[in-house]
């Protein structure tokens, strides 16, 4: 978690900074959304609990050819302790529910904002 912050970071980034940067990236995606995000692609909904970073990455990694979420995918990989590849699913997915990427991002953003406000970074 402390190695987050993007490829250009000069050194380790505190967890609070990493989470803040992920939130700000999700805000950018939400604010800059003009056409349907990722052409309206659908992803598995996830339970926003412990392990959600990996679950979120597992969902989003199945969206290909969407430059708008590439940075988010990279940032989420820094929060996830194991390597995630397309087609991989954890028990945290709500496997009977698919939602649009835009809604997924909105839900994730709200949850992360709550965690950040409460000072829960890990």
């Amino acid at each position: 978690l402390t190695c987050l912050g993007g490829f250009a970071s000069p050194g380790p980034v505190p967890p609070s900074t990493a989470l803040r940067e992920l939130i700000e990236e999700l805000v950018n995606i939400t604010q800059n959304q003009k056409a349907p995000l990722c052409n309206g692609s659908m992803v598995w909904s996830i339970n926003l609990t412990a392990g959600m970073y990996c679950a979120a990455l597992e969902s989003l990694i199945n969206v290909s050819g969407c430059s708008a979420i590439e940075k988010t995918q990279r940032m989420l990989s820094g929060f996830c302790p194991h390597k995630v590849s397309a087609g991989q699913f954890s028990s945290l997915h709500v496997r009977d529910t698919k939602i649009e990427v835009a809604q997924f991002v909105k839900d994730l953003l709200l949850h992360l904002k709550k965690l950040f406000r409460e000072g829960q970074f890990n």
């Epitope: 709200l110 904002k113 709550k114 950040f116 406000r117 409460e118």
Partner: antibody, heavy 119, light 107 residues
């Protein structure tokens, strides 16, 4: 246009419970968060708590044990209840809309406020 | 809790003058700072959020700057309608906290 309006009793007796209603228009409670802020006469502003757009709540830890926030989305109303009122709870109580699509929490629209006296 | 310290407590300015109000956070809040104006008997009104972003409808003579722990609000070309109390607010961590306010009067 965006509007918020607080309503509730102007006078509450000590040890009683305060119940306030914030009725909103021009936006949906499922898309925006609603915050509660109070201001004692001649004093500064104190954040009380928030009703998140998904129905969750967060509170100022100083008030948490006495406070509850709920909502009725069909009526576009948010409710604040605060128990065990004391004279120091005398204040103008505001509900305000949160900026929401931003990384920070700020208040972009405010109600006109309701003055509550504890006596 | 994050403490927000505002200065000065009050100030008076002449018409057309430029004034600055400072706000100091007790810890780093990035750029998560907002400014409000409150007139007597009225609700606060948002002027600036995210340190420097002007809220719709707010005159461009208002500007904000700073980052980390030190912030300022600048009002260029003081007008009669600028009289009131100004508050800063951090939107970084719960509980959200406000400065104690700066009363601005027309000289």
């Amino acid at each position: 246009q965006v509007q918020l309006k607080e309503s509730g009793p102007g006078l509450v007796q000590p040890s009683q419970t305060l119940s306030l209603t914030c009725t909103v228009s021009g936006f949906s409670l499922t898309n925006y968060h609603v915050q509660w802020v109070r201001q004692p006469p001649g004093k500064g502003l104190e954040w009380m708590g928030v009703m998140w757009s998904d129905g969750d709540t967060s509170f100022n830890s100083v008030l948490k044990s006495r406070l509850s926030i709920s909502r009725d989305t069909s009526k576009s109303q948010v409710f604040l209840k605060m128990s065990s009122l004391q004279t120091e709870d005398t204040a103008t109580y505001y509900c305000a809309r949160d900026g929401t699509i931003a990384a920070m929490d700020y208040f972009d629209y405010w109600g006109q406020g309701v003055m509550v006296t504890v006596s | 809790d994050i403490q927000m310290t505002q200065s000065p407590h009050s100030l008076s300015a002449s018409l057309g003058e430029t004034v600055s109000i400072e706000c100091l956070a007790s810890e780093d809040i990035s750029n998560y700072l907002a400014w409000y104006q409150q007139k007597p008997g009225k609700s606060p009104q948002l002027l600036i959020y995210h340190t420097s972003r002007l809220q719709d409808g707010v005159p461009s003579r208002f500007s904000g700057s700073g980052s980390g722990t030190q912030f300022s609000l600048k009002i260029s070309n003081m007008q009669p309608e600028d009289e009131g109390v100004y508050y800063c607010q951090q939107g970084y961590r719960f509980p959200l906290t406000f400065g104690s306010g700066t009363k601005l009067e027309l000289k």
